[in-house]
């Protein structure tokens, strides 16, 4: 009679992770008497699959029944797999023996490859703002799929960028792999609305790519420019200031007026209106009392943004264009947009 | 050279449930089976529960088949014994081992290494 072959049919088998993998294995003989055994990988250091003698095998299932006296069919069902589970899957016929029993035959082995999906993107930006004309870098990361081919782009609002770093980890084999991305990116004063999109390709995701955004609203800050304009006389000892701070992103404002050097006022944005763009405006009014001054007033608005230096703009109010000097003590009373004032 | 360390034991009554934890070190922990064994006075050393590398297969002692669960987390370098419905006769030590080769219950024989081993007393 011929001696006894381990047949597995199958060199290869791929497996989408979650899903149940069947490895094939076939005896072409019920001698010599003895269990059979699954083991991935091979030699000294391979792992103990499934032992048709003894264990707990939560995730392996036998196609056929094993404790049939005339069955050679070996084959297992592996459930719920894993990137970690993939390898060669040999199929070996042991004869038994005493003490122990004696590996007699393997099969020549079948690969198993697990396609997994790669998880969504996840894309940051820079810990601190940064303003227009200045370069940030974003980082894309993806892990967890397998195989190890996969695409990565960039976009911003639709246009794919083209000045990006990507790596793929680890080098070598492995069961699974992860992406990581790093895009620069050019600030403009229009960015406010912007998006940056991280786009990951895989086999598993059916051309369906997954994708990874950050909003440049989180990423940007457009400082203000600053306008102090003298209004028409409102009275005849009364002269109207305003300055209009314009363009500026985030919300977050501190405006402090000075008169001559001397604080008069502060107040923090609150009715501000929105830009197109993304971007506020606001306006601050100051109501001075020229005839408490003798001399020209230097009038500055002075702006902190974001927790930025501030910025200010002056001007400077020419007393003598005003000849009559009455009425009360008080220099200046400083409104905000509501106009509230005491006269 | 694989360092193990077990930790978990203790008192308790009959019944009650306890879990053991080993932490390994010194090795990549994904190429190693892990087994549990225990060592009553006066007795033997004997085998627990067993491991494959990757933990898809288990293998358990009679005596603490249905009771014990052994498991394994190889990103946290640790295995695990849950025991439950403790009797007095599980009192005794518990050894975490590792094995560079595993063929089920011969695991014993196959163990290259040992933890020093916690106390587990299980009191009527």
């Known amino acids: 009679e011929e001696e006894l072959q381990v047949i597995q049919p199958d060199k290869s088998v791929l497996v989408a992770a979650g899903e149940t993998a069947t490895l094939r294995c076939t005896a072409t003989s019920l001698i010599p008497v003895g269990p059979i055994q699954w083991f991935r990988g091979a030699g000294p250091g391979r792992e103990l699959i499934y032992n048709q003698k003894e264990g707990h095998f939560p995730r392996v299932t036998t196609v056929s029944d094993l404790t049939k006296r005339n069955n050679m069919d070996f084959s297992i069902r592996i459930g719920n797999i894993t990137p970690a589970d993939a390898g060669t899957y040999y199929c070996v016929k042991f004869r038994k023996g005493s003490p122990d029993d004696v590996e007699f035959k393997s099969g020549a082995g079948t690969e198993l490859s697990v396609r997994a999906k790669p998880s969504a993107p996840v894309v940051s930006g820079p810990a601190a703002r940064a303003t227009p004309q200045h370069t940030v870098s974003f980082t894309c990361e993806s892990h967890g799929f397998s195989p190890r081919d996969i695409t990565l782009k960039w976009f911003k609002n639709g246009n794919e960028l083209s000045d990006f770093q990507t790596n793929v980890d680890p080098v070598g084999e492995s069961v699974s792999y992860s992406i990581h991305s790093t895009a620069k990116v050019v600030l403009t004063r229009e960015d406010v609305h912007s998006q940056v999109i991280c786009e990951v390709a895989h086999v598993t995701l059916q051309g369906d790519p997954l994708r990874g955004t950050a909003n440049l609203s989180e990423t940007i800050r457009v400082p203000p420019t600053l306008e102090v304009t003298q209004q028409p006389v409102r009275a005849e000892n009364q002269v109207n200031v305003t300055c209009q701070v314009r363009k500026f992103y985030p919300q977050r404002l501190q405006l402090t007026w000075l008169e001559n050097g001397n604080v008069s006022r502060t107040e923090t944005a609150s009715t501000v209106t929105e830009n197109k763009d993304g971007t506020y405006n606001w306006m601050s009014w100051l109501l001075v009392n020229v005839s408490a001054h003798r001399d020209d007033v230097k009038l500055t608005c002075q702006v902190e943004h974001d927790g930025q230096p501030a910025v200010s703009k002056s001007h400077d109010l020419k007393v003598s264009a005003h000849p009559k000097e009455q009425g009360s003590n008080t220099a200046a009373e400083n409104t905000g947009s509501n106009e509230r004032n005491i006269y | 050279q694989v360092q193990l360390q077990e930790s978990g034991g203790g008192v308790v009554q009959a019944g009650d449930s306890l879990g053991l934890s080993c932490v390994a070190s010194?090795?990549?922990?994904?190429?190693?089976?892990m087994g549990w064994f225990r060592q009553a006075p006066g007795k033997e050393r004997e085998f627990v529960a067993g491991?494959?590398?990757?933990?898809?297969?288990?293998y358990y002692a009679d005596s603490m088949k249905g009771r014990f669960t052994i498991s394994r987390d190889n990103a946290k370098n640790l295995v695990y014994l849950q025991m439950n419905s403790l009797k007095p006769e599980d009192t005794a030590v518990y050894y975490c081992?590792?094995?560079?080769?595993?063929?089920?219950?011969?695991?014993?024989?196959?163990?290259?290494?040992w933890g020093q081993g916690t106390q587990v007393t299980v009191s009527s």
């Open positions: 081992a590792a094995a560079l080769t595993f063929r089920g219950s011969d695991l014993p024989r196959d163990s290259n290494y």
């Open positions: 491991i494959s590398r990757s933990g898809i297969s288990q």
């Open positions: 010194g090795r990549t922990f994904s190429s190693l089976d």
